[in-house]
Amino acid sequence: ELENLTVTEVGWDGLRLNWTAADQAYEHFIIQVQEANKVEAARNLTVPGSLRAVDIPGLKAATPYTVSIYGVIQGYRTPVLSAEASTGETPNLGEVVVAEVGWDALKLNWTAPEGAYEYFFIQVQEADTVEAAQNLTVPGGLRSTDLPGLKAATHYTITIRGVTQDFSTTPLSVEVLTEEVPDMGNLTVTEVSWDALRLNWTTPDGTYDQFTIQVQEADQVEEAHNLTVPGSLRSMEIPGLRAGTPYTVTLHGEVRGHSTRPLAVEVVTEDLPQLGDLAVSEVGWDGLRLNWTAADNAYEHFVIQVQEVNKVEAAQNLTLPGSLRAVDIPGLEAATPYRVSIYGVIRGYRTPVLSAEASTAKEPEIGNLNVSDITPESFNLSWMATDGIFETFTIEIIDSNRLLETVEYNISGAERTAHISGLPPSTDFIVYLSGLAPSIRTKTISATATTEALPLLENLTISDINPYGFTVSWMASENAFDSFLVTVVDSGKLLDPQEFTLSGTQRKLELRGLITGIGYEVMVSGFTQGHQTKPLRAEIVTEAEPEVDNLLVSDATPDGFRLSWTADEGVFDNFVLKIRDTKKQSEPLEITLLAPERTRDITGLREATEYEIELYGISKGRRSQTVSAIATTAMG
């Protein structure tokens, strides 16, 4: 007997069949499964005769099915048993929630039956835009995923579906608004004093590796002061500021070198109670007086430091009551520059330091006695002395050989120079100087001086006179003259004077390019420290120009004749003869003769021909005047 067929749903896509039957009776069972509305062909299954139950998977969800079964015994079919049952509803996704929202990402969580889906299909769509949606799939075992790459402050619709091989669930949707891009937060100044301030700022934890704080005096181009602080800090004390000064403070967050845009705040440090107008004046040679101004009742005390400017020795420190506004500092070195600094102390704070420099007075003294501008009859004295102390200076002039009477001068204490004159030349002197003031006579200081010898300029000599010039020479004291002036004037004063300035070491001047055969006056004077000596004078006449003269023709022959002439002895280097027929029918003849010659036979001319003869001498490259003659050769 085959009986008790029961059908139960197995999930939303399958049914379970149970039946009873006699043991070991059936070879197999035939099961037919068909949709109740007969839309699709029936499914047939053959199962072993030993089974009493079977699962039928792969059915449609929420669908009524008719299930039939019969057994087969030795080829015979039993009567058919039938039953009706419906598959379950498709499993829906549970709940979808946005667990975390950032400005460029979010985390999506959802619930779903275990093992129901192969994967989930998620769609991320910007609300109210036609931009393509972002699609992604995640494995069916997941219930959470991160959705990165979103826009800040943007509405999104997120849809999720569960998917199996042949089925996709009804989508679940959720709306979400991404956060604004995170600002660094607020930057505030919570405490301001005259030299410091406290910064506070807000920012999400764990966002930044470090912060960079930049502190800059407003409207200053000086480099800003930078501080780097750990990313965990939210507060920072900024010390070392100037009182009463506007500052701009900026704060950057930083992640691996990437810097945020800055937060900025403007702040003005508090003013200090005024400490100002430090004045330092001398009190004698060994003390200084300090005066300063300060707000009343502001200061607990003042600290004054006195230090020699050029020494790193320990400074003198004084602490004075806050009520004082002046103090004398004795026991200092005379004539020494000091730097004096003062600061006030208010509630433990030091004010900025005021500094001034001043020197103690010199002990009255004289020094650096110098002799200058020595001449044969005078010299100048100069010296240094403490200003405003001396009434008079006494100068004594004594010749070293004690041959002359001592000369004494008293001059005003304001003077620092004296001109001593009326002295003999070439004399050694000792100069003594002392300063006098009430109850003071300084130590005497001294210097030596020797008046110069009178400079000699003498023995003006003229030599090497020739037609075009001459040599001027003279004698003078060694190292006595800075320069010499030589002036040359023609005796008739028809020409401009010629002036030659020569160095003080020269003793000779060669004059050239003068006019032959005229008188000249030569004057030589010397210069010493701008002073000119009276000139030495000499007169001289340049030689006449050397002449060639008396060109005579004699002893005419058919082919020539004899020429003779006169000339100044020892003047000419050579002579030049030019001979040419007067009708210019032949080439001219030019003959150069040596200086001693005064006669020359000319041959090789044409008979009975008239010739023109020219002769000139050459002296030091210059030509003399030409002399001419006419000569005729004899008939043949």
């Epitope: 950032g102 400005w103 460029d104 990402a105 990165p148 800040a152 891009v181 995170p182 600002d183 660094m184 966002t207 590796d209 470090q210 960079t212 780097t228 930083e254 992640v255 691996r256 070198g257 990437h258 810097s259 945020t260 845009r261 800055p262």
Partner: antibody, heavy 118, light 107 residues
Framework: EVQLLESGGGLVQPGGSLRLSCAAS????????MSWVRQAPGKGLEWVSA????????YYADSVKGRFTISKDNSKNTLYLQMNSLRAEDTAVYYC???????????WGQGTLVTVSS | SSELTQDPAVSVALGQTVRVTCQGD??????ASWYQQKPGQAPVLVIY???NRPSGIPDRFSGSSSGNTASLTITGAQAEDEADYYC??????????FGGGTKLTVL
């Protein structure tokens, strides 16, 4: 002079592993964060991973999270990238880069080529 | 998206001024960094922070930032400036992000 020299690239089959090294010199290695950046053939730059100077904090791109591990040995002045479960899309030139405070990725190595292909 | 968006290509005449731009939400908070890459070479940092140049980078390169946009300006472009330029910043998960790159051609 700062120098970064990558090595360890080569051909590997999909699913395989590779370890890249970056030898650093010319700066105090332990004081600086380091990064790996890759560039697929003909494509743009893609950041892969970063590590803090001490090695205590690490960061990964979503595309490599769970597959790649960045580390550094400050005693050897060397940065590493352990790459597992490699995919064809991981084929790229891999650069290591140094980061300074206030200056991101200021020095780069010359790169090493990783090819993932069967 | 949190990606940084760049124009794929820009050209400039020799000696003229060119601006390469980069857009993205992270640039509202962070300054962009800019990298130059020539074919076959590693990238080189040219601008970082508000407008800072590493040593050795010519002063014709400058950077600026406004809203969600960062710009790299080359004043008086030279032939040697022809390259790919990438912008770079940080996103909310402290990860670096790069723009897609801009190919600059100097004509």
């Amino acid at each position: 002079e700062v120098q970064l020299l990558e090595s360890g690239g080569g051909l590997v089959q999909p699913g395989g592993s590779l370890r890249l090294s970056c030898a650093a010199s010319g700066f105090t290695f332990s004081s600086y964060a380091m990064s790996w950046v890759r560039q697929a053939p003909g494509k743009g730059l893609e950041w892969v991973s970063a590590i803090s100077g001490s090695g205590g904090s690490t960061y990964y791109a979503d595309s490599v999270k769970g597959r790649f591990t960045i580390s550094k040995d400050n005693s050897k002045n060397t940065l590493y990238l352990q790459m597992n479960s490699l995919r064809a899309e991981d084929t790229a030139v891999y650069y290591c880069a140094k980061t300074s405070p206030r200056v991101p990725l200021d020095y780069w190595g010359q790169g090493t080529l990783v090819t993932v292909s069967s | 998206s949190s990606e940084l968006t760049q124009d794929p290509a820009v050209s400039v005449a020799l000696g003229q001024t060119v601006r390469v731009t980069c857009q993205g939400d992270s640039l509202r908070s962070y300054y962009a960094s800019w990298y130059q890459q020539k074919p076959g070479q590693a990238p080189v940092l040219v601008i970082y922070g508000k407008n800072n140049r590493p040593s050795g980078i010519p002063d014709r390169f400058s950077g600026s930032s406004s809203g969600n946009t960062a710009s790299l300006t080359i004043t008086g472009a030279q032939a040697e400036d022809e390259a790919d330029y990438y912008c770079n910043s940080i996103n909310s998960t402290r990860n670096e992000v790069f723009g897609g790159g801009t190919k600059l051609t100097v004509l």
